[in-house]
Amino acid sequence: MMTGTIETTGNISAEKGGSIILQCHLSSTTAQVTQVNWEQQDQLLAICNADLGWHISPSFKDRVAPGPGLGLTLQSLTVNDTGEYFCIYHTYPDGTYTGRIFLEVLESSVAEHGARFQIP
């Protein structure tokens, strides 16, 4: 039975040209995290595998930095980066947990972090 929950940074906003940290955290389970995949709608951004380290997709390699931890830093933001991002935790023996983050990239300097929230 899957007992874990994923806590994410929730709905966040950032300024165009700036950077943002996408962060998820898996709790309430003793399952071993074998890999975390980061995706944006229909594109893979990066994979962090416990044994192999990081894979950064070529379309993002110039502006995605691994970490901190299992998170991902997205740099040189554009308005086109607005949208949903998913952290997909591959665990043993539980299986897969998915968290969702919505990023809004703003033209002005009114960017503020949203509240944290949980997805079971």
Epitope: D42, L44, L52, G53, H55, S57
Partner: antibody, heavy 119, light 107 residues
Framework: QVQLQQSGAELVSPGTSVKVSCKAS????????IEWIYQRPGQGLEWIGV????????IYNEKFKGKATLTADKSSNIAYLQLSSLTSDDSAVYFC????????????WGQGTTLTVSS | DIVMTQSHKFLSTSVGDSVSITCKAS??????VVWYQQKPGQSPKLLIY???YRYTGVPDRFTGSGSGTDFTFTISSVQAEDLAVYYC?????????FGGGTKLEIK
């Protein structure tokens, strides 16, 4: 120039073991991942596993657990595939392939090592 | 394990024709797919990755597309030297897996 040079063809008896080598040159060995692939005559490619020579971390295809052991010697830039309890089903070409840095895209391949298990 | 299914084991085409090879993943693999070419007696060669980027030195007649579970590899104007087996491969989750291969035959 990046190169992966594999050891030569092997003819071995059933029940024995063999160690295939893959020597890397032209790059920082510990910045690469090395994967191993198996191909029986006239058949497709099958993934055996992958090793991170920097950390020693390995991942295996469940099918090859107990059959294959992946190791790497950082001092000599050599990755090894050891195969044990050999049977005729293990007769195949074994390839090593390398992927640089933050990538799981394997763009450098060895020439292949032919293993024949026969009594 | 994720199964990568290439529906055609063989495809026959003529020089100058366009040909497409399809690959279907048994579950979501996002864009973590590459295509290899293996000519008789040779090691596989990386052609396309991620899954629409052409590897260095690969002619622009080779293209790839897809996301999620459905992927396509296309040769826009087949040349005689394209006689080979083409494999799709996913690295979305371990164990990484290959498609069964599609052998391209030139009429």
């Amino acid at each position: 120039q990046v190169q992966l040079q594999q050891s030569g063809a092997e003819l071995v008896s059933p029940g024995t073991s063999v160690k295939v080598s893959c020597k890397a040159s032209g790059y920082a060995f510990t910045n690469y991942l090395i994967e191993w692939i198996y191909q029986r005559p006239g058949q497709g490619l099958e993934w055996i596993g992958v090793i991170n020579p920097g950390s020693g971390g390995t991942i295996y295809n469940e099918k090859f657990k107990g059959k294959a052991t992946l190791t790497a010697d950082k001092s000599s830039n050599i990755a090894y595939l050891q195969l044990s309890s050999l049977t005729s089903d293990d007769s195949a070409v074994y390839f090593c392939a390398g992927s640089y840095g933050s990538s799981y895209t394997f763009d450098y391949w060895g020439q292949g090592t032919t293993l024949t298990v026969s009594s | 394990d994720i199964v990568m299914t290439q529906s055609h084991k063989f495809l026959s085409t003529s020089v100058g024709d366009s040909v497409s090879i399809t690959c279907k993943a048994s579950q979501h693999v996002s864009t973590a797919v590459v295509w290899y070419q293996q000519k008789p007696g040779q090691s596989p060669k990386l052609l396309i990755y991620s899954p629409s980027y052409r590897y260095t030195g690969v002619p622009d007649r080779f293209t790839g597309s897809g996301s999620g579970t459905d992927f396509t590899f296309t040769i826009s104007s087949v040349q005689a030297e394209d006689l080979a087996v083409y494999y799709c491969h996913q690295h979305y989750s371990t164990p990484w897996t290959f498609g069964g291969g599609t052998k391209l035959e030139i009429k």
